[in-house]
Interface confidence: medium
């Protein structure tokens, strides 16, 4: 069962899945100037049996300019750098969910993929939140949200996470410089598409933060 909505947005925070439940779909999106090959998959699907899970289908991109070739251009160094880390490298990282049965790891990048990944999550998926660079969490413990099914509807639990600017301790958090304003992450009320671009770029920077950066909702 697909989750109807995106995980909750938290001011000055981004989220990431450590691993993906079977049934999760990842759109095969190509960067500007490239397109999916004609016979290529629309999405990758996390599938598996009792002992092993993996991504079915492969995403392939080809240049939009050359119609009859599947020649793939090697990404430039800065593009490779942007994709370098797809998991939180923080020492506060939760248990590796990918070691659990029924979960797939982050799929490796494919050549000329779009700069943002769009996932379709399923019930039971857990995502973890982290404050963006320059902000620290005022809670401790894993900041997680889980997609749950209640009365036939899906919902994400609300993580109890506050991110505040470290330089500003005499006033309420949120009044600091708007560099990490959540406006940069528009969300659709009806879409179940989830993007992780911001997270992939920012976790490299945020991984060096010393403070505990996660917390959780209790119910």
């Amino acid at each position: 069962e697909l989750c109807d909505d995106d995980p909750p947005e938290i001011p000055h925070a981004t989220f990431k899945a450590m691993a993906y439940k079977e049934g999760t779909m990842l759109n095969c999106e190509c960067k500007r100037g490239f397109r999916r090959i004609k016979s290529g998959s629309l999405y990758m699907l996390c599938t598996g049996n009792s002992s092993h899970s993996s991504w079915d289908n492969q995403c392939q991109c080809t240049s939009s300019a050359t119609r009859n070739t599947t020649k793939q251009v090697t990404p430039q160094p800065e593009e490779q750098k942007e994709r370098k880390t797809t998991e939180m490298q923080s020492p506060m990282q939760p248990v590796d969910q990918a070691s659990l049965p029924g979960h797939c790891r982050e799929p490796p990048p494919w050549e000329n993929e779009a700069t943002e990944r769009i996932y379709h999550f399923v019930v039971g998926q857990m995502v973890y939140y982290q404050c963006v660079q320059g902000y620290r969490a005022l809670h401790r413990g894993p900041a997680e949200s889980v997609c749950k099914m209640t009365h036939g509807k899906t919902r994400w639990t609300q993580p109890q996470l506050i991110c505040t600017g470290e330089m500003e301790t005499s006033q309420f958090p949120g009044e600091e410089k708007p560099q990490a304003s959540p406006e940069g992450r528009p969300e659709s009320e009806t879409s179940c598409l989830v993007t992780t671009t911001d997270f992939q770029i920012q976790t490299e920077m945020a991984a060096t933060m010393e403070t505990s950066i996660f917390t959780t909702e209790y119910q």
């Epitope: 947005e9 005022l138 413990g141 109890q160 958090p173 949120g174 009044e175 917390t215 209790y218």
Partner: antibody, heavy 116, light 107 residues
Amino acid sequence: EVQLVESGGGLVQPGRSMKLSCAASGFPFSDHAMAWVRQAPKKGLQWVAYISYDGDNTYYRDSVKGRFTISRDNARSTLFLQMDSLRSEDTATYYCTTGGNSGYDWGQGVMVTVSS
Amino acid sequence: DIQMTQSPSFLSASVGDRVTINCKASQNVNKFLNWYQQKLGEAPRRLIYGTNSLQTGIPSRFSGSGSGTDYTLTISSLQPEDVATYFCQQYSSWPWTFGGGTKLELK
């Protein structure tokens, strides 16, 4: 089950002090930011003070800055609000709340009346 | 501070009615908006978080919508137990601020 129980309210004269306490149970208190919210009679709600899980970061609304002090005792799972130089406009019901993104759980509140 | 303006401030409706309460922010709050219900003599309780996510245990007749500066709480079919004061609250920017409240009563 999460429980937040406030105490220490009552009638106090302007300029005097009062200390509120909030006993927490049913959740890992030392992992969570906490806050005090107040509601004047027949009025809306106002965030008053906020404290990080470890007590290292505290925040106050402008009107109480320098007069109120929020603190916590994680060993006793208790939140405090020390209110000095009280004014008549501080008269309100004071609620203890888990910080969260909005105040996920609330106590039943304690009434503070500042009057001569 | 971000100002939150609720309308109407008072509302009278009949059981079974569809009720809508509006909340306008003085600036974009990026869907970081919650709705609370406060019954007489009780503490507020959160109904909706993040504009449209229903809090656990809250009946599905409550729903939220909106974006930018304009938000709405809808009760699809009013029940007697819904008599209360309703508050919106933004958590986009500190200090978090509440609307002035909408008092809902039965006709």
